[in-house]
């Protein structure tokens, strides 16, 4: 004969566990039904009656099958530097992530607790390591033959243009200025592996590093100490 299908609540066989979407109620000593996501246990089961479930109230949720007496409260509304990427519903918590131009300086289980603006590299410095959702931009001085004339969290150092005749040599924060004849083309820095420029190499002045006012995030970076913030602005 086929085994009887037990309906909740039921007493489990000794040494066995309750089935999927059931839990063992210590008081009743019975296997009882869990409540589905979006619900909670309004009345716990007894030896003769199963769990009574009820829907979560506004701004509360349960994400899993459960037997909690109260639904969890959704997190607070997203701050102005965040965007809501998942709304608060009866079945899921609100998720806030950082808006473009910001990164997560302090994360939580889902989403972000604290966003910070991405560091901006000042003229003479370029982005050496782009910012990510969870890490800040790293700025580095422009190498000889390259420049950056912007304050930006995305711009890299760009090669100086080649001039047939240089009017003003380029430096770390300014492109070379050619005389009225047009430049041959934008150049990459000449090196062992690169063709040499038409004209004599531009004079290159390294910018003086200045400390950043951006917040330190050394404890947040996944691989070692925080990169230096020199060449960045805090705005």
């Amino acid at each position: 004969l086929p085994a009887q299908v037990a309906f909740t609540p039921y007493a489990p066989e000794p040494g066995s566990t309750c089935r999927l979407r059931e839990y063992y109620d210590q008081t009743a000593q019975m296997c009882c039904s869990k409540c589905s996501p979006g619900q909670h246990a309004k009345v716990f089961c007894t030896k003769t009656s199963d769990t009574v479930c009820d829907s979560c109230e506004d701004s509360t949720y349960t994400q899993l099958w459960n037997w909690v007496p109260e639904c969890l409260s959704c997190g607070s509304r997203c701050s102005s530097d965040q965007v809501e990427t998942q709304a608060c519903t009866r079945e899921q918590n609100r998720i806030c992530t950082c808006r473009p131009g910001w990164y997560c300086a302090l994360s939580k289980q889902e989403g972000c607790r604290l966003c910070a603006p991405l560091r901006k590299c000042r003229p003479g410095f370029g982005v050496a390591r782009p910012g990510t959702e969870t890490s800040d931009v790293v700025c580095k001085p422009c190498a000889p033959g390259t420049f950056s004339n912007t304050t930006s969290s995305t711009d890299i150092c760009r090669p100086h243009q080649i001039c047939n005749v240089v009017a003003i040599p380029g430096n770390a924060s300014m492109d070379a200025v050619c005389t009225s004849t047009s430049p041959t083309r934008s150049m990459a820095p000449g090196a062992v592996h690169l063709p040499q420029p038409v004209s004599t190499r531009s004079q290159h002045t390294q910018p003086t590093p200045e400390p950043s006012t951006a917040p330190s995030t050394s404890f947040l970076l996944p691989m070692g100490p925080s990169p230096p913030a020199e060449g960045s602005t805090g705005d």
Epitope: P130, P141, A143, T146, C157, L221, G224, P225, P228
Partner: antibody, heavy 114, light 108 residues
């Protein structure tokens, strides 16, 4: 004139370690990232990792995490790549490059053979 | 990690022919952080096009680059013998930095 001067070719036995060097002229390594790139014979380019010599911060491709160690000595303006437990798979040309990978060294040929 | 897929792996072109090779990223890459390199046997890679569309030093005007998001390309308007080489695309938008497997361009 910017150049990245790399150490000479190496012939080493399997199981050994080797340390390759890269010394730029024309800029201070504290002002850049130093990257290392691997190229096996007749193969493509593989990024190994990078170091920020200003603070010793390193990042590796997970594939090379247990194989490579990148270090830098700011006093001699030199970056290093140490490779351990060498096998024939490590036979390759190793290049160093600057922050934006604009400047590259001439490459160091490493041959692992018994 | 961002995987860069180059196609074709090998191609051949006649002198004067227009050549286009592509580089497809597994996830979006900022055009600022997408470079192309040219490499010939026995030499180090040479920066050829930086930030998607800017020609490096000494690169002939017949070369051009374009693209955005996940799709990038390098074009030679009229093939010359000296263009025979392997071309690699490279991204450093996200760590780990990655290279495409390369497109080997041969002279037909």
């Amino acid at each position: 004139e910017v150049q990245l001067q790399q150490s000479g070719a190496e012939l080493v036995k399997p199981g050994a370690s080797v340390k390759l060097s890269c010394t730029p002229s024309g800029f201070n390594i504290k002002d850049t990232y130093m990257h290392w790139v691997k190229q096996r014979p007749e193969q493509g380019l593989e990024w190994i990792g990078r170091i920020d010599p200003a603070n010793g911060y390193t990042e590796y491709d997970p594939k090379f995490q247990d194989k490579a160690t990148i270090t830098a000595d700011t006093s001699s303006n030199t970056a290093y790549l140490q490779l351990s437990s060498l096998t024939s798979e490590d036979t390759a040309v190793y290049y160093c490059a600057d922050t934006q990978l604009y400047y590259w060294g001439q490459g160091t040929t490493l041959t692992v053979s018994s | 990690q961002i995987v860069l897929t180059q196609s074709p792996a090998i191609m051949s072109a006649s002198l004067g022919e227009r050549v286009t090779m592509t580089c497809t990223a597994s996830s979006s890459v900022s055009s600022t952080y997408l470079h192309w390199y040219q490499q010939k046997p026995g030499s180090s890679p040479k920066l050829w096009i930086y930030s998607t569309s800017n020609l490096a030093s000494g690169v002939p005007a017949r070369f051009s680059g374009s693209g955005s998001g996940t799709s990038y390309s390098l074009t030679i308007s009229n093939m010359e013998a000296e263009d025979a080489a392997t071309y690699y695309c490279h991204q450093y938008h996200r760590s780990p930095l990655t290279f495409g497997a390369g497109t080997k361009l041969e002279l037909k």
